[in-house]
């Protein structure tokens, strides 16, 4: 079964920098991926960043820099502008959209407990919806 | 919840010009849909596909229409125009907004699979 996992990390040297990275683990092609923010994307959520493997990628503020890592995962660093940090406690979802499988999509955020440069466990919490 | 609201329509004489706009906003979130895209329904005709773009930027027009009009949307991703040029008589029409999601991103043939839609603006070109 194709799983999608997320990590959230906060960068060491900038406390206001947040970065979202996101894996496909499963057979298929990712034909798109969408970022979302405060929960999963069409469910409340908003889209930060879609990223297209051949059309390219779109992101909006608070979203820095979207980018493919590998051509099954991707990463999204986000600038904090406000002087408290409304990430640390923010829901961040990325689904996968594969072909022939469908869309899978997971949602992590900030461990609490989380130190500076130490990222949340690569563990999937699997939001149970296949398109 | 999200509302499609369309607003530019108007009275026009042939070979004038008018800017569609429409605005997609939701309950609690900002919804940016893959595809927006317009469509339009004349007195006793079904409704047609006018333009349509994706998230990207990517465009597909009627046969219709090309070259002279154009569809666009906004930065943030949340509002779709269309700047309609050299209008004819047989333009006329209640033109209506669409948004939805596609599984690539991109806007899918005829409108299928747009599960939002306004409650249009009317546009009449008169010769």
């Known amino acids: 079964t194709p799983e999608v996992w997320v990590q959230v990390q906060m960068e060491a040297t900038e406390l206001s920098s947040f970065t979202v990275h996101c894996g496909f683990l499963g057979p298929g092609s990712i034909s798109l991926v969408t970022v979302s923010w405060g929960g999963p994307d069409g469910a409340g959520g908003t889209k930060l960043a879609v990223l297209h493997p051949e059309l390219g990628t779109r992101q909006w503020a608070p979203a820095r820099q979207a980018r493919w890592e590998t051509q099954s995962s991707i990463s999204l660093a986000l600038e904090d502008s406000g002087a408290s940090s409304p990430f640390a406690n923010t829901t961040f979802c990325c689904k996968f959209a594969s072909f022939p499988e469908g869309s899978w999509e997971s949602c992590g955020s900030l461990p609490p407990s989380s130190d500076p440069g130490l990222s949340a466990p690569p563990t999937p919490v699997p939001i149970l919806r296949a398109d | 919840h999200v509302q499609l609201v369309e607003s530019g329509g108007g009275s026009v004489q042939a070979g004038g010009s008018l800017r569609l706009s429409c605005v997609a906003s939701a309950s609690g979130f900002t919804y940016r849909p893959y595809c927006m895209a317009w469509f339009r329904q004349a007195p006793g005709k079904e409704r047609e596909a006018v333009a349509g773009?994706?998230?990207?930027?990517?465009?597909t027009y009627a046969d219709s229409v090309k070259g002279r009009f154009t569809a666009s949307r906004d930065n943030a991703g949340f509002s779709l125009f269309l700047q309609m040029n050299d209008l004819k008589p047989e333009d006329t029409a209640m033109y209506y907004c669409?948004?939805?999601?596609?599984?690539?991103?991109?806007?899918?043939?005829?409108?299928?699979?747009?599960?939002?839609w306004g409650q249009g603006t009317q546009v009449t070109v008169s010769s």
């Open positions: 669409a948004a939805g999601d596609s599984p690539d991103g991109r806007c899918p043939p005829l409108g299928q699979g747009l599960n939002y």
């Open positions: 773009i994706d998230i990207f930027g990517g465009t």
